[in-house]
């Protein structure tokens, strides 16, 4: 488990970290995961990578941002507002909500405390 | 029934101390965050500190950090504020809350509140 | 000066509806869960809703709670004279690391 290097992390400069950061194979390594491998994916080519290599991509993505609650908390937001329209009914958002909160945990990061997903204005 | 109940409440001259206990009962006092909110005279609230569980992480406001301490007692399920170098803008009634905050994807709320405690800080 | 800002006083008649906003930035209302409180007169408050929507067992379907960006918003509908009191929002502040309470609004029954 990573440590944390700081309490919070300013929240422009997550910002700027989050917008920098290629935030693509977390969003397409949780529709795999969601959609299953062997369904396709419209909005990408996922059948050439696997679910496993799109984790790895994604979890030194989320590396290059500093560790902290709030900056992951940030990326997750933004991964959750990036694939909301994407999402087809209640029970998909759901899923994808379940499998983004798990992406810490699977790249070895503290979950974000407090952090709301439901950040896309009812939208999602 | 949840109960908190306050005490330890009293007139405090400025740059003295005071301890306030909160007894809980009525619910698993060592699987909760605690927090101590206060409410300056006709005033609004105002967040003072939170505890999580098992006490290994607290929260403090700026204006009271290094001045206060708070610390549970999961064995008693007693809730402490230990109050330092208090001074008139620490006036108020001090309330102990049951934090319903979870450890990730979940907020501060209070759903439980005692009947709170007067601390006057005056010469 | 609260940095989470509330009318400081609204009122109406009973038995109509009102909505008592609750504005924040990116930091706090942003990116972190809202709940709302009750203070009645010489009481301590009560939690009326949290995480943004959600009401304890015990509170009427009357009072509802939404969040739009760095906004929030408490609704009451069928405003009955025992409503009349303080009503307060709260969230978490991760620049701060602290919990913020709006400055309440003073809810008066006519």
């Known amino acids: 488990m990573r440590r944390e290097r700081g309490r919070q992390g300013d929240s422009s400069s997550c910002e700027r970290q989050v917008d920098r950061v290629n935030l693509k194979p977390c969003e397409q390594h949780i529709m795999q995961r969601i959609m299953g491998e062997q369904e396709q994916y419209d909005s990408y080519d996922i059948r050439s990578t696997r679910s496993s290599d799109q984790q790895q991509r994604c979890c030194d993505e989320l590396n290059e941002m500093e560790n902290t609650q709030r900056c992951m908390c940030e990326a997750l937001q933004q991964i959750m507002e990036n694939q909301c329209d994407r999402l087809q009914d209640r029970q998909m958002v759901q899923q994808f909500k379940r499998e983004l909160m798990n992406l810490p945990q699977q790249c070895n990061f503290r979950a974000p405390q407090r952090c709301d997903l439901d950040v896309s204005g009812g939208r999602c | 029934e949840v109960q908190l109940v306050e005490s330890g409440g009293a007139l405090v001259q400025p740059g003295g101390s005071l301890r306030l206990s909160c007894a809980a009962s009525g619910f698993k006092f060592s699987t909760f965050y605690m927090t101590w909110i206060r409410q300056a005279p006709g005033k609004g609230l105002e967040w003072v500190a939170n505890?999580?569980?098992?006490?290994?992480?607290?929260d403090y406001l700026d204006s009271v950090r290094g001045r206060f301490n708070i610390s549970r007692d999961n064995a008693k399920s007693v809730l402490y504020l230990q109050m330092n170098t208090l001074s008139a803008d620490d006036t108020g009634v001090y309330y102990c809350?049951?934090?319903?905050?979870?450890?990730?994807?979940?907020?501060?709320?209070?759903?439980?509140w005692g009947q709170g405690i007067l601390v006057t800080v005056s010469s | 000066q609260s940095v989470l800002t509330q009318p400081p006083s609204i009122s109406a008649a009973p038995g109509q509806k009102v909505t008592i906003s609750c504005s924040g930035t990116?930091?706090?209302?942003?990116?972190?869960?809202v709940s709302w409180y009750q203070q009645l007169p010489r009481t301590a408050p009560r939690l009326l809703i949290f995480?943004?929507?959600k009401r304890p067992s015990g509170i009427p379907d009357r009072f509802s709670g939404s969040k739009s960006g760095s906004s929030a918003t408490l609704g009451i509908t069928g405003l009955q004279t025992g409503d009349e009191a303080h009503y307060f929002c709260a969230t978490w502040d991760a620049d701060l690391s602290a919990v913020l309470f709006g400055g309440g609004t003073k809810l008066t029954v006519l």
């Open positions: 990116g930091s706090n209302i942003g990116h972190n869960y």
């Open positions: 809350t049951r934090n319903g905050l979870q450890d990730s994807y979940s907020g501060d709320f209070f759903d439980h």
């Open positions: 505890i999580k569980q098992d006490g290994s992480e607290k």
């Open positions: 995480d943004n929507t």
